[in-house]
Interface confidence: low
């Protein structure tokens, strides 16, 4: 393993694009550690404010975690000659708040991208597609990890965060080959309706630890390859017939539903019936009611129709405040 560090100071690396020379095949950027044998470059926890320009051509795995990159501009990794081998790029926890269109262009082998733990106030619709064409060239991405990328409330744009992420995922239909998508811990209240239809190759979808209340308008029908659907730790109250039928129709899926506040009233009857006969829910015997109070902690699988009643709605004249 060779390593290089700044000889002058530990100040953040400031790349100068104007003076950038074609990288030598074996050089290692300042403040980074490089292993040609492992095809890996690590520039970790070095407070870098820009992506180093002089990355070695052999790099296959690039770790740029724990820095202060702030903005990822278009062509942030474009080099001449290109970084043709770069397959895995980890930018997690690097204080990114803006990822612009075309940020990952000219990375023909990029299969895995991790942007987790960056407070993305702005994610360009063309961050992954690279262009604003209605159908762009397919992205080589197979795994996209976007856990905890929600910005603090005071940094949010006017538009919904869910909508911003969705726009980037569907732009140009570029992510048709995506197998894995992680969107955990993003405070999502809903999943925009058409997102999953544009991601037909998904095998693994993680939406855990969000604030999803309902899946009524979400369609899983196209996801015939889906193997894992993680919905733990959301705000789901009940799954309705349409969703149950779609999940049952997926040939390989395993669904994870732990730690949701299930409401065990008359609307839950179909879901309980389905749970008793389905094989798709992992750990279904752990699912318990949260509401109403009289049903708290009851196991869903142990309920019968007599348990699942709805309080009659009183006519207005009998209602009290």
């Amino acid at each position: 393993t060779s390593s290089a560090s700044s000889s002058s100071s530990s100040a953040p690396f400031l790349a100068s694009a104007a003076s950038a020379q074609p990288p030598l095949p074996d050089q290692c950027p300042a403040l980074c550690e490089c292993s040609e044998a492992a095809r890996t470059v690590k520039c970790v926890n070095r407070n870098l404010t820009e992506v180093p320009t002089d990355l070695p051509l052999y790099v296959r795995n690039l770790f740029l975690t724990g820095n202060q990159l702030a903005v990822l501009p278009a062509g942030a990794f474009a080099r001449r000659p290109p970084l043709a081998e770069l397959a895995a790029l980890n930018l997690s926890g690097s204080r990114l708040d803006e990822v612009r269109g075309g940020a990952f262009e000219h990375l023909p082998s990029l299969r895995q991208l991790d942007l987790s733990h960056n407070p993305l106030a702005y994610l360009s619709p063309f961050a992954f597609s690279g262009s604003n064409a209605s159908i762009s060239a397919p992205s080589p991405l197979v795994e996209l990890i976007l856990n905890h990328i929600v910005p603090p409330d005071d940094k949010r744009q006017n538009r919904s965060f869910e909508g911003m992420v969705a726009a980037a995922l569907v732009a140009g239909r570029a992510l048709q080959g995506l197998h894995l998508l992680e969107l955990a811990s993003n405070h999502f209240l809903y999943l925009p309706r058409d997102v999953l239809a544009q991601l037909p190759s998904l095998r693994y979808l993680d939406l855990s630890n969000n604030s999803l209340v309902s899946l009524t308008y979400v369609s899983f029908r196209n996801l015939t390859h889906l193997e894992s659907l993680h919905l733990e730790d959301n705000a789901l109250k009940v799954l309705h017939n349409g969703t149950l039928a779609e999940l049952q129709g997926l040939p390989h899926v395993r669904v994870f539903l732990d730690n949701n506040p299930w409401v065990c009233d008359c609307h839950m009857a179909d879901m309980v019936t389905w749970l008793k006969q389905t094989g798709v829910v992992q750990g279904k015997d752990r699912l318990t009611c949260a509401f109403p109070e009289k049903m708290r902690n009851r196991v869903l699988l142990e309920l019968n129709s007599a348990d699942l009643d709805c309080d009659p709605i009183l006519p207005p004249s009998l209602q009290t405040s």
Partner: antibody
Framework: EVQLEESGGGLVKPGGSLRLSCAAS????????MGWVRQACGKGLEWVSI???????YYATWAKGRFTISRDNSKNTLYLQMNSLRAEDTAVYYC???????????????WGRGTLVTVSS | GYDMTQSPSSVSASVGDRVTITCQAS??????LAWYQQKPGKAPKLLIY???DLASGVPSRFKGSGSGTEYTLTISSLQPEDFATYYC????????????FGGGTKVEIK
């Protein structure tokens, strides 16, 4: 009684092809995923392929491109077409039903007795 | 991905002994694991699925446990009919799998 019976095994030269069949009785194959598992003499079990209820297929990495799993629900039969056979494909090939309670790839709760495939010149 | 490593490859034990077999997955398989028993010249038999659920007709001396990447099959009191080879199998993913089964553990008479 639920039964699976494999057929089509035999001796084949390297580079040759063979088509295995698995006929089911006492079970409606269209309601289940089905798979093939093989076992070389004295060796362990090796997963080959699976076909879901909806005919989505998965293959072991080494089987992709050479083996093709298919089903004919009207005949209640599962197939495995094997091309470009090699000596290392010599094994007993089992057909098995994917359990209804299993996950993505699945578990196998009912097995046939197996059919022997020998690849040798 | 999802390679299964089983150990030990063989174990010698006596009737009444407690036997433990372990299986490690190269990635998290979320408890989607089965255990099979196979006797010479016979097809495998499903014992346990979803890491700890007993298949129909399987005696309660067989117990599965584990989560994540580490799983265990325990036979609490070995019976004469339990001498056989045992295999684990991940049921989680069919993508990029060389072999869904572990290498097997032969339980022999001491």
């Amino acid at each position: 009684e639920v039964q699976l019976e494999e057929s089509g095994g035999g001796l084949v030269k390297p580079g040759g092809s063979l088509r295995l069949s698995c006929a089911a009785s006492g079970i409606d194959l269209s309601s289940y995923g089905m798979g093939w598992v093989r076992q070389a003499c004295g060796k362990g079990l090796e997963w080959v392929s699976i076909i879901s209820r909806n005919s989505v297929t998965y293959y072991a990495t080494w089987a992709k491109g050479r083996f093709t799993i298919s089903r004919d629900n009207s005949k209640n039969t599962l197939y495995l077409q094997m091309n470009s056979l090699r000596a290392e494909d010599t094994a007993v090939y089992y057909c098995a039903r994917r359990a209804t309670y299993s996950g993505a790839l699945g578990y196998f709760d009912i097995w046939g007795r197996g059919t022997l495939v020998t690849v040798s010149s | 991905g999802y390679d299964m490593t089983q150990s030990p490859s063989s174990v010698s034990a006596s009737v009444g002994d407690r036997v433990t077999i372990t299986c490690q997955a190269s990635e998290n398989i979320y408890s989607t694991l089965a255990w099979y028993q196979q006797k010479p010249g016979k097809a495998p038999k499903l014992l346990i699925y979803d890491a700890f659920d007993l298949a129909s007709g399987v005696p309660s001396r067989f117990k599965g446990s584990g989560s994540g990447t580490e799983y265990t099959l325990t036979i609490s009191s070995l019976q004469p009919e339990d001498f056989a080879t045992y295999y684990c199998q991940q049921g989680y993913s069919g993508t990029n799998v060389d072999n869904a089964f572990g290498g097997g553990t032969k339980v022999e008479i001491k």
